[in-house]
Amino acid sequence: EPPTACREKQYLINSQCCSLCQPGQKLVSDCTEFTETECLPCGESEFLDTWNRETHCHQHKYCDPNLGLRVQQKGTSETDTICTCEEGWHCTSEACESCVLHRSCSPGFGVKQIATGVSDTICEPCPVGFFSNVSSAFEKCHPWTSCETKDLVVQQAGTNKTDVVCGPQDRLR
C-alpha cells in the first residue's frame, strides 16, 4: 500500500490532516489550524455508513410496494434500509431493487428448495419411482403408490407425472 499522509480516520486537506466524520454524520467544514472538523448528523431517512468527508448523506432505499418490495430492516443514520419481497415473491438481484413471482415446478418436476425472499424456487426432475402431477411452488415429488402393501397389483405403470394405478389381483379359477 502506498504511504498515507494521515492517521486512520483522518484525511489530508490544505497540507493538514483533519478528522473524518463518524458514521451517521456528514462534513460541514474542514478543520483549520484552530478548529476541529465540523460534522452534522444525517437527517431523517438519510445515512452514511463509513468514516467519511461527504457533504451530503445518502437517502435510505425506498422499498416500493408497487415492485413487490417491503421493509425487512429499517435504516438508521449509519445503515441503509434493507428491502425484501412480499410473500410469494423474491428479489431479482442482491440489491433487491425489484421482485418477481416465485417460479412453480411443472408436472414431472418437484420442489428441491422452496423459494425465499432472496432466492427462487429450485426444481428437480422426479426420479423413477416418484411423480408430480401439479404445477406448484411447494410440492415435492411424491413416491408412487406401493400396490403390494395394499395387496393390489399394478394395473398401469407410473410416470414422472402420474402415479401408478393399482387393481385387484386376478383370481385363479
Epitope: E1, C6, R7, E8, L12, C17, S19, E36
Partner: antibody, heavy 126, light 107 residues
Framework: QVQLVQSGAEVKKPGASVKVSCKAS????????MHWVRQAPGQGLEWMGW????????NYAQKFQGRVTMTRDTSIPTAYMELNRLRSDDTAVYYC???????????????????WGQGTLVTVSS | DIQMTQSPSSVSASVGDRVTITCRAS??????LAWYQQKPGKAPNLLIY???TLQSGVPSRFSGSGSGTDFTLTISSLQPEDFATYYC?????????FGGGTKVEIK
Amino acid sequence: QVQLVQSGAEVKKPGASVKVSCKASGYTFTGKYMHWVRQAPGQGLEWMGWINPDSGGTNYAQKFQGRVTMTRDTSIPTAYMELNRLRSDDTAVYYCARDQPLGYCTNGVCSYFDYWGQGTLVTVSS
Amino acid sequence: DIQMTQSPSSVSASVGDRVTITCRASQGIYSWLAWYQQKPGKAPNLLIYTASTLQSGVPSRFSGSGSGTDFTLTISSLQPEDFATYYCQQANIFPLTFGGGTKVEIK
C-alpha cells in the same frame, strides 16, 4: 508505569532479514499507535512507519516500502518490525516509540513520542 | 516530504548560559512540532510538543515558541545535565521528519 522493552542486539549478513520486538506494558496497548525510528551510528533520527495495534493498520515511509513489515500480537502486547534484504547502511539502533496520547488533537497527525524502547542495535556486516 | 533544518549543528556554551536552537520547516506545519533531548547511548526524551507545551517532568528552563515554518527551543540557564543533542520533529503529516540535530557542548 509505561515500559517498552525491546529485543537484544543482532548481527546480520547483507541480504538477510531481521525482526525486532517491542513489548509494551503499563498502558492499553491497543489505544496508541506504535512507531519505529532508527538512528545510524553518529547520525540523526529517521522515522520508518507506524502500526495501529488496534486495527493492525500500518503506514510505512516511502524509503522502506516493500522492505519493512510491522506487525503486532495484542495477546502479549508486543509490536514487531521486520526489515528484509538488509544492507550495510541499515546498520543502526532501532527504536520503538509510543504516540503521545493527545486528547485534543483535532488536526495534524500529532505523533509525538513520550515513551521509547531502549533501542536494538542491528549490525549488518559480511 | 517536509524537510526540517536545524541550526546551529553544534553550539559551545557554559553552565548558566542562555542557549537558543532554531528549526525551520520546508512548508507550514502550524504548531505541530516537538523537541527531544538525546544523550549518548540513550533513547531520545520528549521535552516540548505542539511547539510550546512542556512535557510533564521537564524543567521550566526549557521553552519552545513559533508556528508555521520557524520554531525555537530556548534553554534559559544551561545546567550540566543539559549537555546533549537536541532534535526537532514535525507532527503535521506523515512521513514524520526530524531535524539533523544540534549538539550542545561544554565550552
